[in-house]
Interface confidence: low
């Protein structure tokens, strides 16, 4: 069965659905589960063999305005002696999230949904070895 | 709320904060980026803390398919390819925003929902506890 996409009407539309102008959708930005908290291990970003730092990007015309991005600290991974091992690679792990973008055109304001790719953390991988023919 | 700069020549009636409900263009910017992590990289297999990806599907949500990572081992894979139990594979979790159909089954009415997903795994050293 086809999974319905945003804006596609694979559903039987209930009578209670709000009227929406063509080409747009109604979006309530009061977040469900707003106060949910991540319960990750402490200092995971420092204790990882592929450690990372966090930076916060801020944009007042985006909702949410703050998006946290991770950056791997090293090219290699940290070995048992605490030294960087460049035979391995620290690589970013990424996840998509949605944000609402506000656009100003003159005095009118419009809203656009946008997919944003967030770097969540890093993992240590074995490199792909390419042999020259 | 979120305060934003706006054109000083515009009428004063506009709220500086994001309104609670907005009408949004149906076309999502950057919509066609690759959402299947199995196709985008093979890190889940090559990592020293490898993970499996589980498909979570919900037609009342956009995106309807989200991939959840589950670490394969308690420990991490060492240079010999064996599990090293002195280290630990842990999930990296992230809060993401998705759209939830509200009221249910409505094609063009949504509410933002925050969900917690495990995106991948990383290998960590333990915190050492000595008994006093």
């Amino acid at each position: 069965r086809k999974i319905p996409k945003v804006g596609h009407t694979f559903f039987q539309k209930p009578e209670s659905c709000p009227p929406v102008p063509g080409g747009s959708m109604k979006l309530d930005i009061g977040i469900i589960n707003e106060n949910q908290r991540v319960s990750m291990s402490r200092n995971i970003e420092s204790r990882s063999t592929s450690p990372w730092n966090y930076t916060v990007t801020w944009d007042p015309n985006r909702y949410p305005s703050e998006v946290v991005q991770a950056q791997c600290r090293n090219l290699g991974c940290i070995n048992a002696q605490g030294k960087e091992d460049i035979s391995m690679n620290s690589v970013p792990i990424q996840q998509e999230t949605l944000v609402v973008r506000r656009k100003h055109q003159g005095c009118s304001v419009s809203f656009q949904l946008e997919k944003v790719l967030v770097t969540v953390g890093c993992t240590c991988v074995t490199p792909v070895i390419h042999h020259v023919q | 709320g979120i305060t934003i700069p706006r054109n000083p020549g515009c009428p004063n009636s506009e709220d500086k904060n994001f309104p609670r409900t907005v009408m949004v263009n149906l076309n999502i910017h950057n919509r066609n980026t690759n959402t299947n992590p199995k196709r985008s990289s093979d890190y889940y297999n090559r990592s020293t803390s490898p993970w499996n990806l589980h498909r979570n599907e919900d037609p009342e949500r956009y995106p309807s398919v989200i991939w959840e990572a589950k670490c394969r081992h308690l420990g991490c894979i060492n240079a010999d390819g064996n599990v090293d139990y002195h280290m630990n594979s842990v999930p990296i979790q992230q809060e993401i925003l998705v759209l939830r159909r509200e009221p249910p089954h409505c094609p063009n009415s949504f509410r933002l929902e925050k969900i917690l997903v495990s995106v991948g795994c990383t290998c960590v050293t333990p915190i050492v506890h000595h008994v006093a």
């Epitope: 319960s39 | 420990g75 139990y85 002195h86 630990n88 842990v90 333990p126 915190i127 050492v128 008994v131």
Partner: nanobody
């Protein structure tokens, strides 16, 4: 608070046996690795025997064939059966556990050490 409680140490004659036990508190809910280490006066702490969550065992060469590590999963306990004891086995024996614990609603990975139990082999 996570605790490892060792017991079973004591004074034994050469050739005798002792069984050490180490019980981990309940809030360690997944144990990756449990091990026994020992430290004789003036020496470094050394690994005696270890067992991983998949029941793989590892022994120091000096104790192979004499000592056996085993576990009781429901009781979160690891045992060290020591047979044919020699005077050079005299040391403080420490239990070590690496595992995932719950503390104040947070899960984490920790490396835990017991307070040690004295084993003396002497005639």
């Amino acid at each position: 608070e996570v605790q490892l409680v060792e017991s079973g140490g004591g004074l034994v004659q050469p050739g005798g046996s002792l069984r050490l036990s180490c019980a981990a508190s309940r809030n360690i809910n997944i144990i990756n690795y449990m091990a026994w280490y020992r430290q004789a006066p003036g020496n470094q702490r050394e690994l005696v025997a270890a067992m991983t969550s998949d029941a793989t065992t590892e022994y120091a060469d000096s104790v192979k064939g004499r000592f056996t590590i085993s576990r009781d999963i429901p009781e979160n306990t690891v045992y060290l059966q020591m047979n044919s004891l020699k005077p050079e086995d005299t040391a403080v024996y420490y239990c070590n556990a690496k595992g995932i614990w719950d503390y104040l609603g947070r899960r984490d990975f920790g490396d835990y050490w017991g307070q040690g139990t004295q084993v003396t082999v002497s005639s």
